[in-house]
């Protein structure tokens, strides 16, 4: 088992919002739960966008997770992944 | 470490409003997390009643979303409960507890206090 | 709303046992679950989030399965300690909701 290194971007949308990205990568196997939370809650799927799990190359593999927040309120969402048995999640940087 | 404190009177009349203050020490609930009420009725059953969080937003049960607010003093790090127009049914042990947004549990709740509607 | 079905709503066990408790939900919650113990007269307390993890300094003795809409805690070599009553609670929308509780006693 090849745990994924997450890293969350964020970048700027329209007016008054931005998108995060929350991307997983080099884990191995496969499977892996990569999503949005708000407010401690899931965040409801069709206002997230993911990528496809993508070998990237060395054996392992990547993939992303992105949604548009409003300016203001990173605070109330956090990047899940849960990959092999282990968690972890992950802020929206300032 | 959080510590919460539930304090208001521990009775009610019928038809009256429910008052209780959650005295939060050890973290500025300005700084982060969602601030909630739960409930626990005499036979047990736990109801999540709301929250106001860092920002002063507020979601509510909408079995309750009637008759509850959810509001705050910054100044004295406290927020409150008010639950308007009770019924015994209303008669409950009622918590104080807070969550962060890593996901919707309840690390530490308050020791409770107990409120009995009754005329 | 999501409803938390939990199962056996009280049991009697004696010290040295497993058991095994059990909570449904009406829909699937993709392991966003807690459970808690509560004792007579006190607060409930935090032992498992996302339905497998166990909060910090619950004993390795309890440990917490399940997927889609049932998942179980299970308790080995049941303590003294142990007795007391067990909350499921959801965290995959709201309204949070909890189960209603199973009640673990002394036989």
């Known amino acids: 088992t090849v745990p994924p290194m997450v890293n969350v971007t964020r970048s700027e949308a329209s007016e008054g919002n931005i998108t995060v990205t929350c991307r997983a990568s080099s884990f191995y196997p496969r499977n892996i739960i990569l999503t949005w939370r708000q407010d401690g809650v899931s965040l409801a799927h069709d206002t997230q966008q993911w990528g496809d799990v993508l070998p990237d190359g060395n054996g392992t593999y990547q993939t992303w997770v992105a949604t548009r927040i409003c300016r203001g309120e990173e605070q109330r969402f956090t990047c899940y992944m849960e990959h092999s048995g282990n968690h972890s999640t992950h802020p929206v940087p300032s | 470490d959080v510590q919460l404190q539930e304090s208001g009177p521990g009775l009610v009349k019928p038809s009256q409003s429910l008052s209780l203050t959650c005295t939060v020490t050890g973290y500025s609930i300005t700084s982060d997390y969602a601030w909630n009420w739960i409930r626990q009725f005499p036979r047990n059953k736990l109801e999540w009643m709301g929250y106001i969080n860092y920002s002063g937003t507020t979601n509510y049960n909408p079995s309750l979303k009637s008759r509850i607010s959810i509001t705050r003093d910054t100044s004295k790090n406290q927020f409150f409960l008010q639950l308007i127009s009770v019924t015994t049914e209303d008669t409950a042990t009622y918590y104080c507890?807070?969550?962060?947004?890593?996901?919707?549990?309840?690390?530490?709740w308050g020791q409770g206090t107990l409120v009995t509607v009754s005329a | 709303d999501i409803q938390m079905t939990q199962s056996p709503a009280s049991l009697s066990a004696s010290v040295g046992e497993t058991v095994t408790i059990t909570c449904r939900a009406s829909?699937?919650?993709?392991?966003?679950l807690a459970w808690y113990q509560q004792k007579q007269g006190k607060s409930p307390q935090l032992l498992v989030y996302?339905?497998?993890m166990l909060a910090d300094g619950v004993p390795s003795r309890f440990s917490a399965s399940g997927s889609g809409t049932q998942y179980s805690l299970k308790i080995n070599s049941l303590q003294p300690e142990d007795f007391g009553s067990y909350y499921c609670q959801h965290f995959w929308s709201f309204p949070l909701t909890f189960g209603a509780g199973t009640k673990v006693e002394i036989k």
């Open positions: 507890s807070y969550y962060r947004y890593d996901g919707a549990w309840f690390p530490y």
């Open positions: 996302n339905a497998i």
């Open positions: 829909g699937n919650i993709h392991n966003y």
